[in-house]
C-alpha cells in the first residue's frame, strides 16, 4: 500500500490519504442514496478483519451495472495486493450470509472509520 | 432479458412443508449463482439461500439451515426450494433471483403463509 496513485492526484497517494478518500467516498454513496443502492443487490457479507479490502472487492466486483459503487470497486483495487476477478472467493471470505449492498457500505464505512481514528491506514 | 417466475406458494400449517419453484430465461441460467430472498410483511429482505453454478456449493441463512433445501436443474432452467418445518416467521414473498442482479430482475414473487 505504498502507491495508490489515479484516485485524485497523480503521484503516489500515502495510506491515510488513499483511506480518507475510500471513506469520502462510501460518505457520499450513503448520503447520496434515494433509491435502493444497487436496485437492491445482495453481496456476500464479509469479516472486517484481516485481508478485509480483498474481500470486500471479492464481493462488490460480482456486482455489474452500478455505476454507483464503480468508483468504490476501483478504489479497493488499489488496497488489493492480488487481481481480483467477479466469481473468485479467498479463503477469508466465508460465505455465510448475503446481504444488501446498501448494508455492505454501511458496515464497511463504520469500520473504515474506526481504522481512521485508530491510525491503522494498511 | 433476465425473466424470473416463482410458483409453489400458499398457506400451509405450522410445521408443514413447500416447495417452490423458479423458472428462468433469458440468461445462461447454468453459468449463474442463484438466489432465494424473502421479504416479510413490513420487513426488509432477507437472504434466504444460494447455490453455486455447478450445484457444488448450497449456503443458508441461520434461520432456515436445517429445514430448507436449495436445489437447481439446469437441464430445466429451473430453481427449487424445498421448504420442511415451516414455522409462523417463514410468512414471507419469496424471490428468485439472479445474483447480483437489483430487484428490476427479480420475478414478482411467491407468497408463503405459515398460519394455522
Known amino acids: 500500500l505504498t502507491c495508490l496513485g489515479g484516485f485524485a492526484s497523480p503521484g503516489p497517494v500515502p495510506p491515510s490519504t488513499a483511506l480518507r478518500e475510500l471513506i469520502e467516498e462510501l460518505v457520499n454513496i450513503t448520503q447520496n442514496q434515494k433509491a435502493p443502492l444497487c436496485n437492491g443487490s445482495m453481496v456476500w457479507s464479509i469479516n472486517l478483519t484481516a485481508g478485509m479490502y480483498c474481500a470486500a472487492l471479492e464481493s462488490l466486483i460480482n456486482v455489474s451495472g452500478c455505476s454507483a459503487i464503480e468508483k468504490t470497486q476501483r478504489m479497493l483495487s488499489g488496497f488489493c495486493p492480488h487481481k481480483v476477478s467477479a466469481g473468485q472467493f479467498s479463503s477469508l471470505h466465508v460465505r455465510d450470509t448475503k446481504i444488501e449492498v446498501a448494508q455492505f457500505v454501511k458496515d464497511l464505512l463504520l469500520h473504515l472509520k474506526k481504522l481512521f481514528r485508530e491510525g491503522q491506514f494498511n | 432479458g433476465v425473466q424470473l417466475l416463482e410458483s409453489g406458494g400458499g398457506l400451509v400449517q405450522p410445521g408443514g412443508s413447500l416447495r417452490l419453484s423458479c423458472a428462468a430465461s433469458?440468461?445462461?441460467?447454468?453459468?449463474?449463482?442463484m438466489d432465494w430472498v424473502r421479504q416479510a410483511p413490513g420487513k426488509g429482505l432477507e437472504w434466504v439461500s444460494t447455490i453455486s453454478p455447478s450445484r457444488r456449493g448450497t449456503y443458508y441463512a441461520d434461520s432456515v439451515k436445517g429445514r430448507f433445501t436449495i436445489s437447481r436443474d439446469n437441464s430445466k432452467n429451473t430453481l427449487y426450494l424445498q421448504m420442511n418445518s415451516l414455522r409462523a416467521e417463514d410468512t414471507a414473498v419469496y424471490y428468485c433471483?439472479?445474483?447480483?442482479?437489483?430487484?428490476?430482475?427479480w420475478g414478482p414473487g411467491t407468497l408463503v403463509t405459515v398460519s394455522s
Open positions: 433471483a439472479k445474483a447480483y442482479t437489483g430487484r428490476s430482475y
Open positions: 433469458g440468461f445462461t441460467f447454468d453459468s449463474a449463482e
